[in-house]
Interface confidence: low
C-alpha cells in the first residue's frame, strides 16, 4: 500500500508522541556520541517537517523516503568527522548504501560513562520540572547504550518507567517505592536488550531462514493449537517487524508490531487460549504481553510424528516437492509436541532431519536409509539434559556467586585471550542461569537454560567481533547459530595460550572497594580471578579457591581497619607475596 | 562454516613478485580484523602482516615492511598479499587466518611459496 509520503503515513499512524520518541531512539541508536540537546533539537526538525508533509504529502521532499530524511538530518551534524571518525564517510554514499553504512557502525560497546543513579530527591524534582525532558532524557540513555534495543518494547518500559515516577514521588517514603522498581525495570531492560541483539544477529549474519526457524519452533511451542498456515503467517509477520527494527526502520517496525497484535487480538480463537487478558490491555502492554505468553495447552491425542515424516511413503516426494515448507512441517509438529525442549534443540533436531533427507533421498532405497532418523535425535537430546542437570547441581552446591566463579575459570582457560572485562560480563550472566532457571520443573528447564544461554553467548559473540582475538570464539560464533553452545561447551583449556606475565598493580587494591555495594565489590573479585587465570591458566581449583578466599578475608579485614589504605598496602603486598607463592608465579 | 581457501603461490626467484589470495565465505567478511601468517619447515608460524576490518589501519612483520602490501576487498570477501622483492627466506606455506591469530580458521591448507634461483 504506496503511500505519497512515508513520513506522513507514519506519523499519522503512530501519532505524535510515538513518532517523536521513536526518531529519538533511531538517531541516539547511529550517533551514540552525541549529546541529548543535539539529537533533541534534530528530532524537533523532523518532527516539524512531518507535520507539513501530514498537511500537504505534496509537499517539498515529503515524498523521500524515511531513511533518505533521517539521513540527510543525522549528516548535518557538524561534528561528524571528529566525534565519529569514518563514520563521517557514510555520508558520501546513497541509499541504500548509506544506512547500511551507519548500521555497520554502531556500537555494542560504546566508550559512554556508566550511569549513575542520582538522590531519589534530585530525580523526583528532575521528574516534576520537566516531565517531557526527563522521559525524553531516558530513551536516549537507554537507546545509545543498547544500539539494538526493540525501539516498540523500549516505549513500553519507558511508559513504565514514568508510572513508577509518577507513583513513587509523592510517597511518604520516596525511595523505598521507587528503587526497587529502577532495578527491576533496569535488569529487565538488560535482559530485553540481550534477548533482541541475539534476534538481530540471527538476521544479520545468518540471514532470515535462520531466523523463520526459530520463529516456527518458537511460537509453534507457545501456540500449539494454531494450524501450521496460521504459525506461519505469524512467523512471516514478526519476521518482517523484527527486520525493519534490527535495520534501523523503527517507525515501520513499531507500526508493523502494532497491526500484527492487532490481527493475534482478532484472530486469537485459532492461536491461543491463553491471549484473553492480553488483548484487553492497552497497545504497548497488550504487545509486550503477547511476546511474554505463557505456552498454550498442547491438543490431545496428537498422532506420531513417525507416520508423516519416517513411514510415509511420500516424504521424499513431499520433501523434493517444497523442501521448506516440508521442514517448516516438521518443525512446526516437532516444536508443539516438545515444550519441554529449547528452539535451539528443536532446530538441531531439524536440521539432522534436513541432513538425512539430503543424503537418502539420493540413495537406491530412501526408506531403508532414513528409517532410523529419529534415533539420530536421542543423543542430541541427551546432551543439553545432562548439561543442566550437571550444572543444576553444581549451583545448588555453591550458590549463584561461586557457581559463577567456577564459569568464570572455565571459560577464562577456553579463551584467555578474551578481555577480562568481557570474561566478567558473560560469565556472571551465564551463571545467573541457575537462580533463573535451576528452580523450574524438569519440563521447563531445558527451554529456559539453553535459550537463555544462546543469548548470553552472543553477547560474547558481539563483544568479540568488535575486537577479535580468539579464532576459537570466532569459530563458535560464526559456524552455526544453534551449535554456539555445545561448540563453547566442548572447547578444553587452550594448550596454545602463553600465560600473562605477572603484574602486581592488577592485584593493587585501595580503600575505595570498601565503599562499593556487594556487587561491585563482586565484580572486583572475579576481576582479579580470572587475570589470576590468565597468569596461571593450569592453576588448579583448590589453588584458585585458597588465593580467593585469602582475598575476600584481605578485603574484609582492611575494610574494619581503623587505616584502611596502610592496611591495603601493607596486607596487600603479604598478598601478592602468598598469592604467588601458593600458584607457583 | 568458515572457509578460507589460500592461492596465489608457486616459485619464484629472488627479487620476484607474488600476490596472495584468500577467499573468505561462511562468515560475515568485513566485519572481521585478518592476518596472514607464514610457516616455514621446522619453524613454528609467523604473522606477516594484519588489516583491519575496514582496512584502515595495516600491520607488517619487521622482516616483510617495505616489500609487502597487505589489503582486502570487502566487497567480494577477499584478503590480498602483495609480495615484491622475495627474499629465499620468504619461503614457507602461506595462509589468511579470522583476527590476529596465527593458528588456521578454516579447513584451507595454505598457499607454498618458494624462492629460488
Known amino acids: 500500500d504506496a503511500h505519497k509520503s512515508e513520513v506522513a503515513h507514519r506519523f499519522k499512524d503512530l501519532g505524535e508522541e510515538n513518532f517523536k520518541a521513536l526518531v529519538l531512539i533511531a538517531f541516539a541508536q547511529y550517533l551514540q556520541q552525541c549529546p541529548f540537546e543535539d539529537h533533541v533539537k534534530l528530532v524537533n526538525e523532523v518532527t516539524e517537517f512531518a507535520k507539513t508533509c501530514v498537511a500537504d504529502e505534496s509537499a517539498e521532499n515529503c515524498d523521500k523516503s524515511l531513511h533518505t530524511l533521517f539521513g540527510d538530518k543525522l549528516c548535518t551534524v557538524a561534528t561528524l568527522r571528529e566525534t565519529y571518525g569514518e563514520m563521517a564517510d557514510c555520508c558520501a554514499k546513497q541509499e541504500p548504501e548509506r544506512n547500511e553504512c551507519f548500521l555497520q557502525h554502531k556500537d555494542d560497546n560504546p566508550n559512554l560513562p556508566r550511569l549513575v543513579r542520582p538522590e531519589v530527591d534530585v530525580m523526583c524534582t528532575a521528574f516534576h520540572d520537566n516531565e517531557e525532558t526527563f522521559l525524553k532524557k531516558y530513551l536516549y540513555e537507554i537507546a545509545r547504550r543498547h544500539p539494538y534495543f526493540y525501539a516498540p518494547e523500549l516505549l513500553f518500559f519507558a511508559k513504565r518507567y514514568k508510572a513508577a515516577f509518577t507513583e513513587c514521588c509523592q510517597a511518604a517514603d520516596k525511595a523505598a517505592c521507587l528503587l526497587p522498581k529502577l532495578d527491576e525495570l533496569r535488569d529487565e531492560g538488560k535482559a530485553s536488550s540481550a534477548k533482541q541483539r541475539l534476534k538481530c544477529a540471527s538476521l544479520q549474519k545468518f540471514g532470515e531462514r535462520a531466523f523463520k526457524a526459530w520463529a516456527v519452533a518458537r511460537l509453534s511451542q507457545r501456540f500449539p493449537k494454531a494450524e501450521f498456515a496460521e504459525v506461519s503467517k505469524l512467523v512471516t509477520d514478526l519476521t518482517k517487524v523484527h527486520t525493519e527494527c534490527c535495520h534501523g526502520d523503527l517507525l515501520e517496525c513499531a507500526d508493523d508490531r502494532a497491526d500484527l497484535a492487532k490481527y493475534i487480538c482478532e484472530n486469537q480463537d485459532s492461536i491461543s487460549s491463553k491471549l484473553k487478558e492480553c488483548c484487553e490491555k492497552p497497545l504497548l502492554e497488550k504487545s509486550h504481553c503477547i511476546a511474554e505468553v505463557e505456552n498454550d495447552e498442547m491438543p490431545a491425542d496428537l498422532p506420531s510424528l513417525a507416520a508423516d515424516f519416517v513411514e510415509s511413503k511420500d516424504v521424499c516426494k513431499n520433501y523434493a516437492e517444497a523442501k521448506d515448507v516440508f521442514l517448516g512441517m516438521f518443525l512446526y509438529e516437532y516444536a508443539r509436541r516438545h515444550p519441554d525442549y529449547s528452539v535451539v534443540l528443536l532446530l538441531r533436531l531439524a536440521k539432522t532431519y534436513e541432513t538425512t533427507l539430503e543424503k537418502c533421498c539420493a540413495a537406491a532405497d530412501p526408506h531403508e536409509c532414513y528409517a532410523k532418523v529419529f534415533d539420530e535425535f536421542k543423543p542430541l537430546v541427551e546432551e543439553p539434559q545432562n548439561l543442566i542437570k550437571q550444572n543444576c547441581e553444581l549451583f545448588e552446591q555453591l550458590g549463584e556467586y561461586k557457581f559463577q566463579n567456577a564459569l568464570l575459570v572455565r571459560y577464562t582457560k577456553k579463551v584467555p585471550q578474551v578481555s577480562t572485562p568481557t570474561l566478567v560480563e558473560v560469565s556472571r550472566n551465564l551463571g545467573k542461569v541457575g537462580s533463573k532457571c535451576c528452580k523450574h520443573p524438569e519440563a521447563k528447564r531445558m527451554p529456559c537454560a539453553e535459550d537463555y544461554l544462546s543469548v548470553v553467548l552472543n553477547q560474547l559473540c558481539v563483544l568479540h567481533e568488535k575486537t577479535p582475538v580468539s579464532d576459537r570464539v570466532t569459530k563458535c560464533c560464526t559456524e552455526s547459530l544453534v551449535n554456539r553452545r555445545p561448540c563453547f561447551s566442548a572447547l578444553e583449556v587452550d594448550e596454545t595460550y602463553v600465560p600473562k606475565e605477572f603484574n602486581a598493580e592488577t592485584f593493587t587494591f585501595h580503600a575505595d572497594i570498601c565503599t562499593l555495594s556487594e556487587k561491585e565489590r563482586q565484580i572486583k573479585k572475579q576481576t582479579a580471578l580470572v587475570e589470576l587465570v590468565k597468569h596461571k591458566p593450569k592453576a588448579t581449583k583448590e589453588q584458585l579457591k585458597a588465593v580467593m578466599d585469602d582475598f575476600a578475608a584481605f578485603v574484609e579485614k582492611c575494610c574494619k581497619a581503623d587505616d584502611k589504605e596502610t592496611c591495603f598496602a601493607e596486607e596487600g603486598k603479604k598478598l601478592v607475596a602468598a598469592s604467588q607463592a601458593a600458584l607457583g608465579l | 562454516q568458515v572457509q578460507l581457501v589460500e592461492s596465489g603461490g608457486g616459485l619464484v626467484q629472488p627479487g620476484g613478485s607474488l600476490r596472495l589470495s584468500c577467499a573468505a565465505s561462511g562468515f560475515t567478511f568485513g566485519q572481521f580484523g585478518m592476518s596472514w601468517v607464514r610457516q616455514a619447515p621446522a619453524k613454528g608460524p609467523e604473522r606477516v602482516s594484519a588489516?583491519?576490518?575496514?582496512?584502515?589501519?595495516?600491520i607488517y612483520a619487521d622482516s616483510v615492511k617495505g616489500r609487502f602490501t597487505i589489503s582486502r576487498d570487502n566487497a567480494k570477501n577477499t584478503l590480498y598479499l602483495q609480495m615484491n622483492s622475495l627474499k629465499p627466506e620468504d619461503t614457507a606455506v602461506y595462509y589468511c587466518?579470522?583476527?590476529?591469530?596465527?593458528?588456521?580458521?578454516?579447513p584451507g591448507q595454505g598457499t607454498q611459496v618458494t624462492v629460488s634461483s
Open positions: 587466518t579470522i583476527g590476529s591469530s596465527t593458528t588456521p580458521s578454516g
Open positions: 588489516i583491519s576490518s575496514d582496512a584502515s589501519g595495516t
